[in-house]
């Protein structure tokens, strides 16, 4: 019997359990850089000495065609930075192989712009969101997610890449930011702090949340991540803040309960498929959006960031598990893996709702100073 080649994935192609690193934000070269001089971090903003995760291994994705199985895991090589040798940058081997992108850390040498010049760009991420300065943009419709509900088999790869914990997502998870703005999810990863120290990447009115989830997507206009890097809208990241709540979050527990198995840097495990959308807030209609960059090297710009207004609640125990279980390089704890906020440099953050008049994660005065750039859409 001949194996029918599935367009998205089929046995003969990539292991259904997800061996090879598909596009991951963490697997994209990371996005975080040491705090920049023009945006001195507050004490909270300075990650400790730990080597923390970023958005590094974003593998390539093949176009969807009738003849060829696209989005098979093994067909998703990781992304090389410009000038790097054409070898997959699997995080497990980065530090040992000595490629340029492997030698970066949070809050330490070398300066990120030396690792990747794009890290010194003018339109970087993360940023501080000031709701009262956001431009209300009625054209920003509710996000649409399709295919995010996964059966338990095949299992998915959960990996400690030394900079974050990353879940490699299978083909077929489709996301639309609006008509004609369609993407495919590649991977998700988290950013966190340490005991008593919040670790979200984005902030709201200067407030840093305990943690943040990033779901990284590739535009359907591109077949490979490296083609999309630096192109406006080539990549899109859905970001949500994680906060402490009274109850255990059952969706997150499916991942957090497995962290002990991957405590060591470079280790990975397989976890049953789950409802990926359950890891995000339920309100897909209220969010902030702006164009920025990856928050770890190569810090490629043109990334569309969508930050949910609603937060996700995890129990105190779950947040502690997240920040206190994994180890990074050099026998250091994997903590405080966030980049300092970057200057907007004239960028206007758009809001899908009248944020200046409403309560967003951290409410402010009801003033709307900026107008929607996409008002004509």
């Amino acid at each position: 019997q001949r194996l029918p080649r599935m367009q998205e994935d089929s046995p003969l192609g990539g292991g259904s359990s997800g061996e090879d690193d598909p596009l991951g934000e963490e697997d994209l070269p990371s996005e975080e850089d040491s705090p920049r001089e023009e945006d001195p971090p507050g004490e909270e903003d300075l990650p400790g000495e730990e080597d923390l995760p970023g958005e590094e291994d974003l593998p390539e994705v093949k176009p969807k065609s009738e003849e060829e199985g696209s989005l098979k895991l093994e067909d998703l090589p990781t992304v090389e930075a410009p000038g790097d040798p054409q070898e997959p940058q699997n995080n497990a081997h980065r530090d040992k192989e000595g490629d340029d992108q492997s030698h970066w850390r949070y809050g330490g040498d070398p300066p990120w712009p030396r690792v990747s010049p794009a890290c010194a760009g003018r339109f970087q991420s993360p940023v501080d969101i000031r709701p009262q300065l956001a431009a209300f943009c009625p054209a920003l419709r509710p996000l649409e997610l399709l295919g995010f509900q996964l059966p338990p088999l095949p299992e998915l790869r959960l990996r400690n890449n030394g900079h974050s914990v990353q879940l490699t997502l299978p083909p077929g998870l489709e996301m639309a930011l609006g008509p004609g703005r369609e993407y495919r999810a590649l991977q998700l990863h988290l950013h966190w702090g340490a005991a008593g120290r919040p670790g979200s990447e984005h902030t709201v009115e200067g407030h840093r949340f305990p943690a943040e989830i990033h779901v990284v997507h590739l535009s359907t206009a591109f077949a490979r991540v490296d083609e999309a890097l630096g192109r406006p809208g080539g990549l899109a990241v859905l970001a949500a803040f994680l906060e402490e709540g009274p109850e255990e979050n059952s969706a997150y527990e499916q991942l957090l309960s497995r962290l002990e198995e991957i405590a060591e840097e470079g280790s990975e495990t397989q976890v049953p498929g789950l409802d990926i959308s359950a890891l995000l807030p339920s309100d897909f209609s209220r969010y902030f959006q702006y164009e920025g960059s990856l928050t770890t090297p190569p810090c490629a710009q043109g990334v569309i960031w969508t930050v949910f207004n609603q937060t996700v609640m995890l129990s105190a125990k779950q947040l502690h598990t997240l920040s206190d279980t994994l180890w990074g390089p050099g026998d250091s704890r994997l903590q405080l893996n966030f980049r300092a906020t970057q200057p907007l440099n004239g960028r206007v953050i758009e809001a899908s709702f009248p944020a200046g008049v409403d309560s967003s994660p951290r409410a402010a005065e009801p003033v709307q100073l900026n107008s929607c750039l996409a008002a004509g859409d």
């Epitope: 046995p11 259904s16 095949p154 299992e155």
Partner: antibody
Framework: QVQLVQSGGGLVQPGGSLRLSCAAS????????MSWVRQAPGKGLEWVSA????????YYADSVKGRFTISRDNSKNTLYLQMNSLRAEDTAVYYC????????????WGQGTMVTVSS | QSVLTQPPSVSGAPGQRITISCTGT?????????VHWYQQLPGAAPRVLIY???NRPSGVPDRFSGSKSGTSASLAITGLQSEDEADYYC??????????FGGGTKLTVL
């Protein structure tokens, strides 16, 4: 060539046991979750059991829970179904199938093996 | 009784278009899980016809298409041919931790 070759079917008395085997070739067996699906004579398809790629997680239909055991030997590229306390209603053609598709589809099927439970 | 409901039989003349429905509940199709379709020719093992609601494996003619909406899904076959005569099954996943099938639909080409 991608294929799943089954063996082990036959006639067994009620209360008896039988072990089905499914030998995989042409694809990296150890990377894929696998399932057993059965089809009673003249009836439709019924999922029986599933196992993760590394064998660490198993799933069973309520109708066989506690009686059937799914297992795999990745070094031999072989999937097994140990069937105990067999009943007349277990009579069916049993197919092994590959859970290789991320969307939850079974994309490679064995040729099927007949299990008849009768006194 | 099957978890997913299909009509027992459908028929059509060569060249015609037919559809086969598959109705589930809020714990399977309605929960967001994908629907897959299989064709089983007499005496043979099933083969995937449509996966992920509307994707065709290579080798499957574009006369076959799938769609999904709410708690139901459907398989459409256009330009019906005699070799399409077979049993067709829909399949999804259910929150009860099981993979579920429809009862099957016998397609007769008149």
């Amino acid at each position: 060539q991608v294929q799943l070759v089954q063996s082990g079917g036959g006639l067994v008395q009620p209360g008896g046991s039988l072990r089905l085997s499914c030998a995989a070739s042409g694809f990296p067996f150890s990377s894929y979750a696998m399932s057993w699906v059965r089809q009673a004579p003249g009836k439709g398809l019924e999922w029986v059991s599933a196992i993760s790629a590394n064998g660490g997680t198993t799933y069973y239909a309520d109708s066989v829970k506690g009686r059937f055991t799914i297992s795999r030997d990745n070094s031999k590229n072989t999937l097994y179904l140990q069937m105990n306390s067999l009943r007349a209603e277990d009579t069916a053609v049993y197919y092994c199938a590959n859970n290789g598709n991320y969307r939850g589809a079974f994309d490679i099927w064995g040729q099927g093996t007949m299990v008849t439970v009768s006194s | 009784q099957s978890v997913l409901t299909q009509p027992p039989s459908v028929s059509g003349a060569p060249g015609q278009r037919i559809t086969i429905s598959c109705t589930g509940t809020s714990s399977n199709i309605g929960a967001g899980y994908d629907v897959h379709w299989y064709q089983q020719l007499p005496g043979a093992a099933p083969r995937v016809l449509i996966y992920g609601n509307n994707n065709r494996p290579s080798g499957v003619p574009d006369r076959f298409s799938g769609s999904k909406s709410g708690t139901s899904a459907s398989l459409a076959i256009t330009g019906l041919q005699s070799e399409d005569e077979a049993d067709y099954y829909c399949q999804s996943y259910d929150k009860s931790l099981s993979w579920v099938f429809g009862g099957g639909t016998k397609l007769t080409v008149l």
